[in-house]
């Protein structure tokens, strides 16, 4: 529905929506009627793109046509002519203008000289009613250059190079109603320049270099309705009545300037103003009485400024206001009674504002509110009487569910089950792997414990998703601020960090043994246990520090429904941002680089030492197996961490990251390592396969009653498990020679390749 038709609809049928709506259908708080049928649906099912009512009523009138769009239809119905390529649509095709420059087009009394390389205003007969001189090379408007055009109603001067406008340039234009000066280089407008333009209704001076305006700038503009000064370089508005000479001004657009503050006297004469747009300025201070004179104001747009404090009674006189935009301001606090006086407000934008003290009381007095816009969809729960609340999701959660996507809701259980089962299975099976390298086994069990925590984290998230199913929005804010969320988030970080540090430790052990075999020193039991304890302590510290200082970290884990602090938001504390970057782009990136480099070096070292081997075909085959294994361990690491590094890096560059990313990362990417580590580090290794083989062999032997004296493990070649550290079968371990896998490097170079298969 266009804003025009909405306007007429309202004119004929009155308000297009009321809380009681329909045929006196009464719905309970948070529910809204389905048109004229008795059915009521909750807020979250209205305006969600799905016909939930069955008669489309829940998807009708969802557009926010409040504020300027209505005003535009009211006063400026022909707006789009202004932007059309050919601004004129004369009724008569033949030219009625006496003398026309050869390069210009003419229809009726309208002249089109666009893009004709004009350097000055052309001289034509005085009966012309519209003149378009867009996209030319005009630099100056000298005195009396339009003096004879008493009938001229529309003058288009956009996209020239105008720097100089004589104080007498527009003298004689007594019939002019629309003047377009956009996209020029005007730095200053002298008081009196518009003195003769008593009938001017539209003055558009967008995209120029104006740095200062004062009330006398507009002297003579008694009929002005629309004034657009978008995208100039105004740094302040005068501390004098701006509308002194524009008593009929309805619409003032000052978007995209550099205005720092608004003075008390500025709007004192603007009593007819209905739309005031001041978005994208640098306003940092507002006085209590700044907007007091604007009692007819219908829309106030203060979005994207630097406002930190709103005086409690700043909106008290805006009884007619229907649309208010305060989005993207660093507002610290909103008073509970801030909006009490805005009885006619229909649309309220608070996007990008962290409302720490949010409460239903703030919005309850706004009985006509039909559209509200927040930073977080969780805030929608505080405005249950508002039919359309955006956003209705943060990409992770929706109004109904903690996990918005059905895929995520299913896979959170699948992934957590795989992760938990895989790791628990390895923890239980490790003791059965006959290996003298108990220290290595201890590291792997430690790794599995860490990875298991990731599974537990996902189970908890899945559990709370189930708990809040269908009504998440009611609990969202409390959930994200809850101890549960903090703890489960720190569990995920603990798992991640311990896992990363353990993998790095294991990789470095292996790297030193293979690349520098003669420098390899056997890590004793004491050292290994110390390292493991240190890793876990580090993990705990990293995970729980944010919980220790709320002032510094704010709600570190509670920035989203899955309680995982992946990417920082603008409002997150600087401390939290730095901390998050230090973890993901500091510790974890460094660890990832070490792992990639180590496996690369190991493969290169093995490849070099194998060149001298005699059995070429065997060698190539084994090298391929080794390459495949190394590739998979690095590939899974990359699969897990590269997306996280990219997201973190982009968020650091202030790139807009969709909320959906976090949930997909948390459910599908982050657990990759946790789910696959058991497979890569245990289930696919030779000792494990041999153990399974042994179990199977023993089982069959028992069945055939012929198991006595059978060897269960007798590989045909000297084999050393190097995945991820060498694990020697006891039959091949010569205590005096091979007391620790590192010492395997004393074996001749030619047999080295066998070590990896």
């Amino acid at each position: 529905m266009t804003s025009g038709s909405v306007f007429f609809y309202i004119l004929i049928f009155g308000k297009y929506f009321s809380h009681g709506g329909g045929q006196d259908v009464k719905c309970s708080l948070g529910y809204f009627p389905c048109g004229n049928i008795t059915k009521c649906l909750p807020q979250l099912l209205h305006c969600n793109g799905v016909d939930d009512c069955g008669n489309q009523a829940d998807e009708d009138n969802c557009g926010d046509n409040n504020g300027w769009s209505l005003q535009f239809d009211k006063y400026f119905a022909s707006y789009y002519k202004m932007t059309s390529q050919y601004p004129f649509e004369a009724e008569t095709p033949e030219c009625l203008v006496g003398s026309v420059p050869v390069q210009c087009l003419c229809q009726g009394l309208e002249l089109d000289c666009d893009e004709t390389n004009l350097r000055a205003v052309p001289s034509v007969s005085s009966n012309v009613t519209a003149m378009s001189l867009q996209w030319n090379l005009i630099r100056k408007l000298p005195p009396d250059c339009f003096k004879n055009y008493h009938d001229l109603q529309k003058l288009y001067l956009q996209n020239n190079k105008i720097t100089s406008i004589s104080i007498y340039a527009f003298r004689g234009l007594n019939s002019l109603t629309k003047l377009y000066l956009s996209h020029n280089r005007i730095t200053f407008l002298k008081p009196g320049v518009f003195e003769d333009l008593h009938r001017l209704e539209w003055l558009i001076i967008e995209d120029n270099h104006l740095s200062r305006i004062s009330p006398p700038t507009f002297y003579g503009l008694n009929s002005l309705i629309l004034l657009v000064l978008m995208n100039n370089v105004l740094t302040r508005l005068p501390d004098k009545p701006l509308c002194q000479h524009m008593p009929r001004l309805h619409w003032l657009d000052l978007e995209g300037n550099h205005i720092h503050n608004l003075r008390n006297l500025t709007f004192i004469s603007c009593s007819n103003l209905t739309v005031l747009v001041m978005r994208k300025n640098k306003i940092n201070h507002l006085n209590e009485n700044t907007f007091a004179p604007l009692q007819k104001l219908d829309e106030l747009d203060l979005g994207s400024n630097k406002i930190e404090n709103l005086p409690p009674l700043i909106f008290k006189d805006l009884k007619e206001l229907s649309q208010l935009n305060l989005s993207y301001n660093p507002i610290q606090k909103i008073q509970a009674n801030q909006f009490d006086y805005l009885v006619k407000l229909k649309s309220l934008s608070l996007e990008g504002i962290e409302i720490s003290n949010i409460q239903q009381r703030m919005f309850r007095p706004l009985m006509n509110l039909s559209h509200i816009y927040f930073k977080k969809f969780q805030y929608c729960g505080y405005a249950p009487h508002v039919r359309s609340c955006k956003p209705n999701t943060d990409g992770i959660s929706s109004l109904e569910n903690l996990l918005a996507s059905i895929i995520q809701r299913v896979f959170v259980w699948v992934v957590s089950a795989v992760t938990c089962f895989g790791n628990i299975f390895v923890i239980c099976m490790r003791p059965y792997i006959r290996s003298e390298n108990k220290l290595y086994a201890m590291s792997i069990i430690s790794l599995c414990c860490a990875d298991c925590l990731m599974g537990i984290y996902l189970f908890v998230i899945g559990g709370f998703d189930l708990k809040f199913r269908g009504e998440y929005n009611k609990h969202a804010q409390l959930w994200m601020e809850s101890t549960h969320c903090q703890l489960v988030g720190s569990l995920a970080i603990l798992s991640t960090e311990v896992s990363v540090l353990l993998l790095t430790f294991l990789t470095l052990e292996k790297y030193i043994c293979i690349v520098y075999p003669f420098r390899c020193v056997r890590p004793g039991k004491c050292r290994t246990i110390t390292v493991l304890i240190l890793i876990w302590i580090t993990g705990f510290i990293v995970a729980f520090i944010p919980l220790s200082n709320k002032e510094f970290f704010k709600n570190y884990y509670g920035t989203n429904g899955v309680c995982f602090p992946l990417h920082s938001e603008d409002t997150e504390s600087i401390g939290a941002q730095i901390y998050s970057v230090a973890i993901f782009l500091g510790i974890n990136l460094a660890a990832f680089i070490i792992i990639v480099f180590s496996y690369g070096s190991m493969f290169y070292s093995v490849h070099q030492s194998a060149i001298t081997a005699t059995e070429i075909r065997n060698q190539v085959k084994k090298e391929m197996i080794l390459a495949k294994r190394f590739f998979f361990i690095v590939f899974t690491d990359a699969l897990c961490w590269i997306p996280i590094f990219v997201v973190k890096f982009l968020s650091l560059l202030q790139v807009e990251i969709p909320g959906t990313i976090t949930s997909w990362v948390v459910i599908f990417i982050l657990p990759i390592n946790s789910a696959l580590n058991p497979i890569l580090y245990t289930l696919t290794t030779r000792p494990f396969k041999e153990m399974i083989h042994r179990f199977w062999y023993n089982y069959r032997q028992r069945k055939s009653m012929d198991s006595k004296g059978q060897k269960t493990y007798a590989p045909s070649f000297i084999w050393v498990e190097m995945w991820p550290l060498q694990e020697m079968p006891p039959e091949l371990m010569k205590p005096d020679l091979f007391t620790y896998p590192c010492e395997m490097s004393l074996i001749s170079q030619s047999t080295r390749l066998n070590s990896y298969s």
């Epitope: 100056k140 720097t163 100089s164 406008i165 004589s166 104080i167 730095t187 200053f188 002298k190 008081p191 009196g192 003195e195 740095s211 200062r212 004062s214 006398p216 002297y219 004098k240």
Partner: antibody, heavy 122, light 107 residues
Framework: QVQLQQPGAELVRPGASVKLSCKAS????????MNWVKQRPGQGLEWIGM????????RLNQKFKDKATLTADKSSSTAYMQLSSPTSEDSAVYYC???????????????WGQGTSVTVSS | DIQMTQTTSSLSASLGDRVTISCRAS??????LNWYQQKPDGTVKLLIY???RLHSGVPSRFSGSGSGTDYSLTISNLEQEDVATYFC?????????FGAGTKLELK
């Protein structure tokens, strides 16, 4: 506060043009007209013309259109008036003065320089 | 051009006196009349603009009145520092024009 600084005196030979300066401070130089006023010894004030630094527009008294050229240097907030082919008739005190049009259409020359005494003599 | 006439070229008064200086325009100037004070050292100051509005920092003993073509400046309580020449100026149309000045002296 608004200040307009002019050199105290200039001695010129007849026929050799002279350029008088006026350095402005304490306000936005680009936003106001700069006026030049002549006062011959023991006589009244005569308006020569005015110049707007924002776009170099000038309005000259017809009487002085061949005598005075008005310019300005925005970067140094300095206004200039060049007198061509001076004669003894041009010996006078020349004032620069700011036109206040903040209350347009009420306009007044609100701040004046100390004046430069020009003596045309061979 | 609009001619501005100050009929009295000089006048003497005593300290504390009420002094009135008049000025006439050759045509209606719609109250666009300003008054200036020039001290003996040559410094010029704006006193009154738009017939009767006092410029900032000007003592309240100065006042202005008039309309159409006839205007006047009044000093209600003459002080030593008021010894100067006073000029009227019309700001209605260009070129701006000044009166010949009235020199105020102490008796």
């Amino acid at each position: 506060q608004v200040q307009l600084q002019q050199p105290g005196a200039e001695l010129v030979r007849p026929g050799a043009s002279v350029k008088l300066s006026c350095k402005a401070s304490g306000y936005s130089f680009n936003s106001y007209w700069m006026n030049w006023v002549k006062q011959r010894p023991g006589q009244g004030l005569e308006w020569i013309g005015m110049f707007h630094p924002s776009d170099s527009e000038s309005r000259l008294n017809q009487k002085f259109k061949d005598k005075a050229t008005l310019t300005a240097d925005k970067s140094s907030s300095t206004a200039y008036m060049q007198l061509s082919s001076p004669t003894s008739e041009d010996s006078a005190v020349y004032y620069c003065a700011r036109l206040d049009d903040d209350n347009y259409p009420l306009q007044s020359v609100d701040y004046w320089g100390q004046g430069t005494s020009v003596t045309v003599s061979s | 051009d609009i001619q501005m006439t100050q009929t009295t070229s000089s006048l003497s008064a005593s300290l504390g006196d009420r002094v009135t200086i008049s000025c006439r325009a050759s045509q209606d100037i719609s109250n666009h009349l300003n008054w200036y004070q020039q001290k003996p050292d040559g410094t010029v100051k704006l006193l009154i603009y738009y017939t009767s509005r006092l410029h900032s920092g000007v003592p309240s003993r100065f006042s202005g009145s008039g309309s159409g073509t006839d205007y006047s400046l009044t000093i209600s309580n003459l002080e030593q520092e008021d010894v100067a020449t006073y000029f009227c100026q019309q700001g209605n149309t260009l070129p701006l024009t000044f009166g010949a000045g009235t020199k105020l002296e102490l008796k």
